[in-house]
Interface confidence: low
Amino acid sequence: FERTRSLQDPCSNCPAGTFCDNNRNQICSPCPPNSFSSAGGQRTCDICRQCKGVFRTRKECSSTSNAECDCTPGFHCLGAGCSMCEQDCKQGQELTKKGCKDCCFGTFNDQKRGICRPWTNCSLDGKSVLVNGTKERDVVCGPSPADLSPGASSVTPPAPAREPGHSPQ
């Protein structure tokens, strides 16, 4: 199929990094500066993404691949391919429409991004609070009172730590 296609369409012979120039009898021309083609057989090259403003260049554009952006310090990526940059907040805060706000009592955020999440409810697991929660840290659940009674086995494996939920990247 590929051989037949190339006999019928000279453009299929143009490799990535070139475009098939209809104005030059379908000769493969190199992508000009600031543009790229990531696949063969392209009739135009695509212009390179610009990482400007809060975006900064993570990977330069080449003739065969687009530039990749990340965010300047104080911001983090959101969306596929870092399509947006969102402002960082401090630990113990979350980003709202009015800017960074402290986590409400009973919630925490241990990252510079994402939302405040409720403290773990130790009593749901039959445990007690060993270390109180803060805006920046979850509570630490300790053993239940029964675990501390005389004769209790000291080799009972601890319950797995509850992993804090991850906010979407």
Epitope: N22, R24, P32, N34, I47
Partner: antibody
Framework: QVQLVQSGAEVKKPGASVKVSCKAS????????MHWVRQAPGQGLEWMGI????????SYAQKFQGRVTMTRDTSTSTVYMELSSLRSEDTAVYYC?????????????WGQGTLVTVSS | QSVLTQPPSVSGSPGQSITISCTGT?????????VSWYQQHPDKAPKLLIY???ERPSGISNRFSGSKSGNTATLTISGLQPEDEADYYC???????????FGTGTKVTVL
Amino acid sequence: QVQLVQSGAEVKKPGASVKVSCKASGYTFTTYYMHWVRQAPGQGLEWMGIINPTGGSTSYAQKFQGRVTMTRDTSTSTVYMELSSLRSEDTAVYYCARTEYSSGWAGDYWGQGTLVTVSS
Amino acid sequence: QSVLTQPPSVSGSPGQSITISCTGTSRDVGLYNYVSWYQQHPDKAPKLLIYDVSERPSGISNRFSGSKSGNTATLTISGLQPEDEADYYCGSYTSSSTRYVFGTGTKVTVL
């Protein structure tokens, strides 16, 4: 400060070739591309092509394909535009213009222009 | 060779605002946010006024502003001054094999 200094005026006969130079100073030569643009008397601007001084890669307007050659000499920070098979309608002022990678090829600094007259 | 279409002339009195349109196609103005505007006084080289549709290089007065809607870009000159009398050209990166194209040019007259 950024400067683009072009070679002097030329008078050529039809069928001849002309080579115009553009010497850059005041910035890192290889970090900007260079346009060539021409303007016939009383007419508008016409894009001819662009050269990447780093590797010498070029892209020419289809109208000038086969007749124009753009080259560069990194040792002297100079770009050249040679136009062959001259005809009377090639009489124009030829400009070089520096363009930044990240600004959609906008020409931010321009040479003073070189008048090329084609006359028998 | 395709060119972008501009009105041949625009005029205004000192202090007034004027606009210059630049109409292209879905392969240039409509496709990319890479429209530039240039000012050219008689017997002088062009000077960059606007790039990337609406960005001003340092040293360019904020009386010059750019915008775009669909396939048409617009240059606005506010508080028109005598020294604004010149030719104005738009330019755009394009997806055609001729990778950059200029407008037809507009002569601005200050009455």
